[in-house]
Interface confidence: medium
């Protein structure tokens, strides 16, 4: 455009300032060691330092670390931005406990109402549930479509929300069957480094974007790419799909870029104890087998820091799974790591607060 | 197998210039940020500054800004340490190293680190 | 700045003795400190990340706990090996600094 010649012009003869073809205006130049916040800057205020990623510019305009939302009671609510931390919560059917600074220092499982109550609201991230008496002449195991799934073996008092963060449990009021999934899948991940992937603790490298097909200019249709025998979890994290290669295990779906491989017990076996995509025991059907110790696959490569906890599986004669999900991960289930005399020390991060009983299990360390 | 080798090291006159490289091999060298820290002789360890060999922006520590200038040369996979205006106190072994790439998050700790050059400012 | 600030400066052990040493950040750095081993003429070698995760191929022997402000290394049982200079890092909030660094000798 002849118009805007002089402008151009004028803008370059301004050393502190360029002129911007693209949106024909004239910039302020950013001073080295300062990034612009936006396209054209205008002025200084639109110019900011640069932090390395998984940094946020602070208040006092330091570099400072977000939060880690690796914990696996742990979910990602905002993330790591510029200008602001990354933001944590505790998962679905969680609560927050003891709150921290853009986290969640300790998380607890909701609670189910004991029969005759029914949820008057319903357990948040924050909150955990909150219960009241049933009325006259409303069945009090169905009077919320969370009491329909009410565990077949006792239920978690109210006044005792289950404490499972960070790496810790309390085997008394944690219902062993119906409903565990929450804590299985907490179990399964107890070797887990921070920020590493699920059940395999090896690092990840970080291969940045890659297009489910070439990635076309301009388009939407790109997506991290993760390792092979990894999948992209919901929340954008490479995640080891389970593994199917215990003898008693067949594949019954791939492992996909965005969902993980799912095992299920091999023709003739059912599962007894089942875990996220996979199964945990197998046993012959339809007779109740004997109790085994099976060894969780995939956990830990000689790399790792962590090895797998010694298993011993509970006995379990359900002839059916328990929550009638999809068969389950390889990985034991949180009572079985709890009952688990072999297990006097759990291999966890080596600052993880848990304590061991008399008995051997792990106790709740408040501090 | 990650490396990095840093070269440049010697003898200087307090008011002179350095130029210090590191050559990085084994990895994708504008994907990780690349850190300078110094050891003087006989003393603890201190961070100089990085570089984001992508975006070419380096960051640096308060005392070193204004002498010293990282920068990097995509082609060559290496980066450089410029340092300006010596003085007897920047005698030290400066090291080149690379931040972690444990799991999800990319926090700034060095499981690389390279054997590091020596530099002297003496008259 | 964040200060860090190792106890002891140095300290004498024999082979099989266990031995801690601790890290005192002037200013809540949360779980975001390493651990490094460093031998005489030698880079520094990553030991622990993330306050208390062993680095890969780091013998179990070495441990690290804490958060916040108060960090510490332990070492259960001395192996000939492991005298040298430790030295503790945060990388929470930029500049990213240093302990002083621990030297462990032989008794």
């Known amino acids: 455009f002849p118009q805007d010649r002089p402008f151009e012009d004028t803008c370059r003869g301004n050393p502190g300032h360029y002129y911007d073809k693209a949106v024909r205006r004239c910039c302020y130049r950013c001073p080295t060691g300062l990034f612009p916040t936006q396209q054209c800057p205008q002025r200084p205020a639109d110019c900011r330092k640069q932090c390395e990623p998984d940094y946020y510019l602070d208040e006092a305009g330091r570099c400072t670390a977000c939060v880690s939302c690796s914990r696996d009671d742990l979910v990602e609510k905002m993330p790591c931005a510029w200008n602001s931390s990354r933001v944590c919560e505790c998962q679905p059917g969680m609560f927050c406990a003891v709150s921290v600074v853009n986290s969640c220092a300790r998380c607890f499982f909701h609670s189910v109402c004991p029969a005759g109550m029914i949820v008057k609201f319903p357990g948040t991230a924050q909150k955990n549930t909150v219960c009241e008496p049933a009325s006259p002449g409303v069945s009090p195991a169905c009077a919320s479509p969370e009491n329909c799934k009410e565990p077949s073996s006792g239920t978690i008092p109210q006044a005792k929300p289950t404490p499972v963060s960070p790496a810790t449990s309390n085997a008394s009021t944690m219902p062993l069957r119906g409903g565990t999934r929450l804590a299985q899948e907490a179990a399964s991940k107890l070797t887990r480094a921070p920020g590493s992937p699920s059940s395999v603790g090896r690092p990840s490298s970080d291969p940045g974007l890659s297009p489910t097909q070439p990635c076309p200019q301009g388009s939407g249709d790109c997506r991290k790419q993760c390792e092979p025998d990894y999948y992209l979890d919901e929340a954008g994290r490479c995640t080891a799909c389970v593994s199917c290669s215990r003898d008693d295990l067949v594949e019954k779906t791939p492992c996909a870029w965005n969902s993980s491989r799912i095992c299920e017990c091999r023709p003739g076996m059912i599962c007894a104890t089942s875990a996220t995509n996979s199964c945990a025991r197998c046993v012959p059907y339809p007779i109740c087998a004997a109790e085994t110790g099976t060894k969780p696959q995939d956990m830990a490569e000689k790399d790792t820091t962590f090895e797998a906890p010694p298993v011993g599986t509970q006995p379990d004669c359900s002839p059916t799974p328990e929550n009638g999900e999809a068969p389950a991960s390889t990985s034991p289930t949180l009572s079985s790591l709890v009952d688990s005399q072999a297990s006097k020390t759990l291999p966890i991060p080596t600052s993880a607060p848990i304590a061991l009983s008399s008995t051997g299990k792990p106790v709740l360390d408040a501090g | 197998e990650v490396q990095l080798q840093e070269s440049g090291g010697g003898l200087v006159q307090p008011g002179g210039s350095l130029r210090l490289s590191c050559a990085a091999s084994?990895?994708?060298?504008?994907?990780?940020?690349i850190h300078w820290v110094r050891q003087a002789p006989g003393k603890g360890l201190e961070w100089v500054s990085y570089?984001?060999?992508?975006?070419?922006?380096?960051d640096y520590n308060q005392n070193f800004k204004g002498r010293f200038t990282t920068s990097a040369n995509k082609s060559k996979n290496t980066a450089y340490l410029q340092m300006n205006s010596l003085r007897a106190e920047d005698t030290a072994v400066y090291y080149c190293?690379?931040?972690?790439?444990?799991?999800?998050?990319?926090?700034?700790?060095?499981?690389?680190w390279g054997q590091g050059t020596l530099v002297t400012v003496s008259s | 700045d964040i200060e860090l600030t190792q106890s002891p400066s140095s300290l004498s052990a024999s082979v099989g003795d266990r031995v801690t040493i601790t890290c005192k950040a002037s200013q809540n750095v949360g779980t975001n400190v390493a651990w490094y081993q460093q031998k005489p003429g030698k880079a520094p070698k990553v030991l622990i990340y993330?306050?208390?995760y062993r680095y890969s191929g780091v013998p179990s022997r070495f441990s690290g706990s804490g958060s916040g402000t108060d960090f510490t290394l332990t070492i259960s049982s001395l192996q000939p090996e492991d005298f040298a200079t430790y030295y503790c890092?945060?990388?929470?909030?930029?500049?990213?600094?240093f302990g002083q660094g621990t030297k462990l000798e032989i008794k």
């Open positions: 084994g990895f994708t060298f504008t994907t990780y940020t």
């Open positions: 993330s306050a208390s």
């Open positions: 190293a690379r931040r972690a790439d444990y799991g999800n998050y990319k926090y700034t700790w060095f499981p690389y």
């Open positions: 570089i984001n060999p992508s975006s070419g922006y380096s």
């Open positions: 890092q945060q990388y929470h909030t930029y500049p990213l600094t």
